[in-house]
């Protein structure tokens, strides 16, 4: 029952004499395992015997009988699924039908497979895409309906008989669906491949040729062009003529239109294969090509670079950068179109040739003021010398130069004068716009660059000015050298170091802080009386009479200055002591008598002592000794002693006479 047997295998298998056949095959016997398998060659059913007749290539029976072909033909299947067969080697007379007679316990089946064995290896088949265009990648396929495990083969690609260097990918299939060997080659054909023969060659494992297939490539491509120019080097001079010819070396399909391009732009009314340029100008220099189109698209020739040679054009100078700051760098560029390029440049500065400068550029690394001026250049090539323009002006900016502060007054300057100074400079670019002065003062600037100092001070020593444009340049300070009378005159005691005592040696110094001019004279005075003309006033032995108010004067050619009055104080022990009596030296008893100790002392007497005629000190220590009531026995000679910090002094004796009163006399 056919519905119970299901087979899958290729319908026909192909091979050649001496090769092998591998027949992939699967089956399903639904009622149980396979019990008998016979492989027939061209089986025919015999109705009489109800059996198949034919050459038995393989037989697998219960009794285990195996025909002699068993070594060449192998059943590689099993009892329930696999029915794969191998014939190795395969022969020409194996062509025909193979019959697989299958028997199970209850069922029988004859499965037929076609085998096509050729005398020689059959050729593979090359498959091409419907259209091939240049530079577009295509896949070339070489297919051979053969594959067998026991007979390795290879497929090789050749272009015009030469192996193609592109890597091909070979694949094989030995399945129940198909048996083949395939080689795929990815390839980007160029226009030059058009009409070329591509071969797929079948080779055995050793690389021995077995068969091949060939195709001629039909590569669609834009027109391929060659451009020819007269003169051949495409170098002409202005006024010459030039001819360019466009030749089509290949086009597939045929070309339709022709045009010419210069620098990528189409030239109008130029639609033939020849381009004639008469009396060329330098503007016609450029890259020329012809363009021819077909259905694929436009094709362009290589470019011809037409060089129209001409003498240098009028030159101009470009300055980087003007104005330039002194010390910066500047570059000059000589701009002059020429073909061929100028071989020599001549540079001029302020009309004078700059020696050794023959390049297109002139670089000055450190600009100085004298570099300012006009720069021009002239370019030269084999065809002549260019027109030299008026040039470009370099402006060099720098701070004011050689700035000086100048005193306008007649010299010398005296304290209190009005002084005028001017700020001068040698050169400046840009112009000076302002001035600065130092030190700063409340001075007036009556005009730009002039400074007026009213009532100049003795201590205005130096003044400096700066002239300023974009920068300030300072002059060296100028000394005003202001002359003035001596200053800060004062009396200073040199000796003694401590207070002055009578009899000391004393020196007074007349000091001053400054004087201009330095030459001075000194004068000492006391109470309007001139004492000396030296800087010092000396006392060998000072006496109290020298005490008083002293002044010194210092004068120079400008004027004189007096010190403050200085008081000279002489310290001495009490002197000229005397005892004075009041109301007199004769006093009546009972009255009051006052004795006073008079003295001259510096410092004043601080302590008094009274003595009587017996040199007996009395218990009284004040300047006055008051006797009240006075008694007759108080009569006698008295003296006093005065003491100060310097020493002591004593008075001579003074006699007090106390007489009796009339009452006393009356009583007696």
């Amino acid at each position: 029952d056919s519905s119970k047997w299901v087979f899958e295998h290729p319908e026909t298998l192909y091979a050649w004499e001496g090769a092998c056949v591998w027949i992939p095959c699967t089956y399903r016997a639904l009622d149980g395992d396979l019990e008998s398998f016979i492989l027939f060659h061209n089986p025919e059913y015999n109705k009489n015997t109800s059996k198949f007749d034919g050459t038995r290539l393989y037989e697998s029976t219960k009794d285990g009988k195996v025909p002699s072909e068993q070594k060449r033909v192998q059943f590689l299947g099993d009892k329930n699924k696999n029915c794969t067969l191998s014939i190795h080697p395969v022969h020409l007379n194996d062509s025909g039908q193979l019959g697989l007679r299958m028997e199970s316990k209850t069922e029988k089946w004859m499965e037929r497979i076609h085998l096509n064995v050729s005398e020689r290896p059959f050729p593979p088949h090359i498959q091409l895409p419907p259209e091939i265009q240049e530079s577009q990648e295509v896949t070339l396929t070489c297919l051979l309906n053969f594959s067998c495990y026991g007979y390795p083969i290879q497929l090789q690609w050749l272009l015009e008989g030469v192996p193609m260097r592109q890597a091909a990918v070979t694949s094989t299939s030995l399945t129940i669906k198909s048996v083949f060997t395939r080689s795929e080659l990815k390839f980007s054909p160029q226009w030059s491949h058009h009409g070329k023969i591509v071969t797929c060659q079948l080779q055995d494992a050793d690389g021995k040729f077995l068969s091949n297939d060939t195709v001629q490539l039909n590569v669609k491509h834009t027109p391929k062009l060659e451009i020819k120019v007269t003169p051949s080097d495409a170098i002409v001079r202005e006024g010459d003529s030039v001819t360019m010819t466009c030749e089509v070396s290949s086009s597939n399909p045929e070309y339709t239109t022709v045009s010419w391009l210069k620098d990528g732009t189409s030239l109008k009314k130029q639609n033939t294969f020849t381009l004639n340029l008469r009396e060329v100008t330098k503007d016609q220099s450029g890259k020329y090509c012809c363009q021819v189109s077909n259905d694929v698209g436009p094709g362009r020739s290589e470019e011809v670079f037409l060089q129209v040679q001409y003498a240098p054009e009028p030159s101009t100078v470009q300055i980087l950068h003007s104005p330039a700051v002194e010390g910066s760098q500047v570059e000059f560029l000589c701009m002059s179109l020429a073909n061929p390029l100028p071989t020599n440049y001549t540079w001029y500065h302020n009309g004078k040739e700059m020696q050794g400068r023959t390049e297109e550029k002139v670089h000055i690394p450190k600009i100085l003021p004298w570099h300012a001026g006009t720069y021009s250049c002239v370019a030269e090539n084999i065809l002549g010398t260019g027109q030299r323009g008026p040039g470009a002006e370099l402006d060099v900016q720098y701070p004011p130069k050689k700035v000086t502060t100048v005193i306008q007054n007649p010299m010398p300057i005296r304290e209190g004068d009005t002084v005028t100074l001017s700020c001068n400079y040698n050169s400046s670019n840009p112009s000076v716009t302002r001035y600065e002065w130092k030190p700063h003062g409340a001075w007036e600037e009556p005009s730009l660059g002039v400074l007026k100092i009213q009532n100049v001070g003795w201590d205005n020593t130096t003044i400096a000015c700066a002239a300023c444009n974009s920068w300030c340049s300072w002059a060296s300070p100028v000394a005003l050298n202001v002359q003035y009378a001596p200053r800060d005159v004062r009396v200073r005691k040199i000796k003694p170091l401590s207070e002055i005592h009578s009899g000391n040696s004393v020196s007074l110094q007349c000091d001053f802080s400054s004087s201009h001019p330095k030459e001075v004279q000194f004068f000492w005075e006391k109470n309007g009386r001139l004492l000396g003309k030296e800087s010092q006033l000396n006392f060998d032995s000072i006496s109290p009479e020298d005490a008083g108010s002293y002044s010194c004067w210092v004068n120079n050619s400008i004027g004189q200055t007096a010190s403050k009055a200085w008081t000279l104080e002489v310290l001495y022990a009490p002197r000229r002591l005397r005892v004075s009596m009041s109301p007199g030296d004769q006093v009546m008893e009972g009255k009051s008598a006052t004795l006073t100790c008079e003295s001259d002392a510096n410092p004043p007497v601080s302590h008094y002592t009274w003595f009587d005629w017996n040199n007996q000190s009395l218990p009284y220590h004040s300047q006055k000794l008051r006797l009240e009531p006075v008694k007759v026995q108080h009569s006698g000679a008295y003296w006093c002693q005065g003491t100060n910090s310097v020493g002591k002094g004593r008075s001579p004796l003074s006699t007090l006479t106390v007489y009796y009163s009339p009452e006393t006399i009356g009583r007696r």
């Epitope: 100008t281 003498a311 009028p314 300012a372 008026p390």
Partner: antibody
Framework: EVQLVESGGGLVKPGGSLKLSCAAS????????MNWFRQAPEKGLEWVAY????????YYADTVKGRFTISRDNAKNTLFLQMTSLRSNDTAMYYC???????????WGQGTSVTVSS | QLVLTQSSSASFSLGASAKLTCTLS???????IEWYQQQPLKPPKYVME???????STGDGIPDRFSGSSSGADRYLSISNIQPEDEAIYIC?????????????FGGGTKVTVLG
């Protein structure tokens, strides 16, 4: 409006001197090179002298070299031509001319007449 | 030597187009030149600066009727729709600085007469 006004022309004896002035207005004088041209009666134009913007570059025609001096005062917008050792063939109308572009003598004064005759 | 050559005179009908030629010495064919107009008893007037490629810049107050062009060593001044006030001597000039000497050369001038 650009204006160039020449003055200083007149009659002078051969060997004598004359100083021509040209007052410029209506443009930045210090931005332009200046020239003196002359035209003898019934004759063509002749270039005499050129001075650059900053007086750095000065050129003279061979016929006047050593006798004429061109100068300018940019602060006063004035161009000068000091002429000495004058000859009879220096007789001409003298024009003060501004130079722009390449060598474009783009503005001309009305001229001042110089006659050298004994 | 730098030389400019001009024809001495040319006559044109009123409203016609005029084309004046100034030819540079052959080795100076790339030079920039200037055109000037001089009317009797007047100073020259700057008309235009003209380059080898025909590009030009005209002076102030010059009508659009004036244009310039070039071919090789020839420099042209064209006046379209010529008017009576265009009657003048047209002079071309060229400047150059050779070595350390400046020169400014004039052509002989073309006297233009406007007829009718």
């Amino acid at each position: 409006e650009v204006q160039l006004v020449e003055s200083g022309g007149g009659l002078v004896k051969p060997g004598g001197s004359l100083k021509l002035s040209c007052a410029a207005s209506g443009f930045t004088f210090s931005d332009y090179g200046m020239n003196w041209f002359r035209q003898a009666p019934e004759k063509g134009l002749e270039w005499v002298a050129y001075i650059s913007r900053g007086s750095h570059t000065i050129y003279y025609a061979d016929t006047v070299k050593g006798r004429f001096t061109i100068s300018r005062d940019n602060a006063k917008n004035t161009l000068f031509l000091q002429m000495t050792s004058l000859r009879s063939n220096d007789t001409a109308m003298y024009y003060c001319v501004r130079m722009a572009g390449y060598y474009a003598m783009d503005y001309w004064g009305q001229g001042t007449s110089v006659t050298v005759s004994s | 030597q730098l030389v400019l050559t001009q024809s001495s005179s040319a006559s044109f009908s009123l409203g016609a187009s005029a084309k004046l030629t100034c030819t540079l010495s052959s080795q100076h064919s790339s030079y920039i030149i200037e055109w000037y107009q001089q009317q009797p008893l007047k100073p020259p007037k700057y008309v235009m600066e003209l380059k080898k490629d025909g590009s030009h810049s005209t002076g102030d107050g010059i009508p659009d009727r004036f244009s310039g062009s070039s071919s090789g060593a020839d420099r042209y001044l064209s006046i379209s729709n010529i008017q009576p006030e265009d009657e003048a001597i047209y002079i071309c000039g060229v400047g150059d600085t050779i070595k350390e000497q400046f020169v400014y050369v004039f052509g002989g001038g073309t006297k233009v007469t406007v007829l009718g």
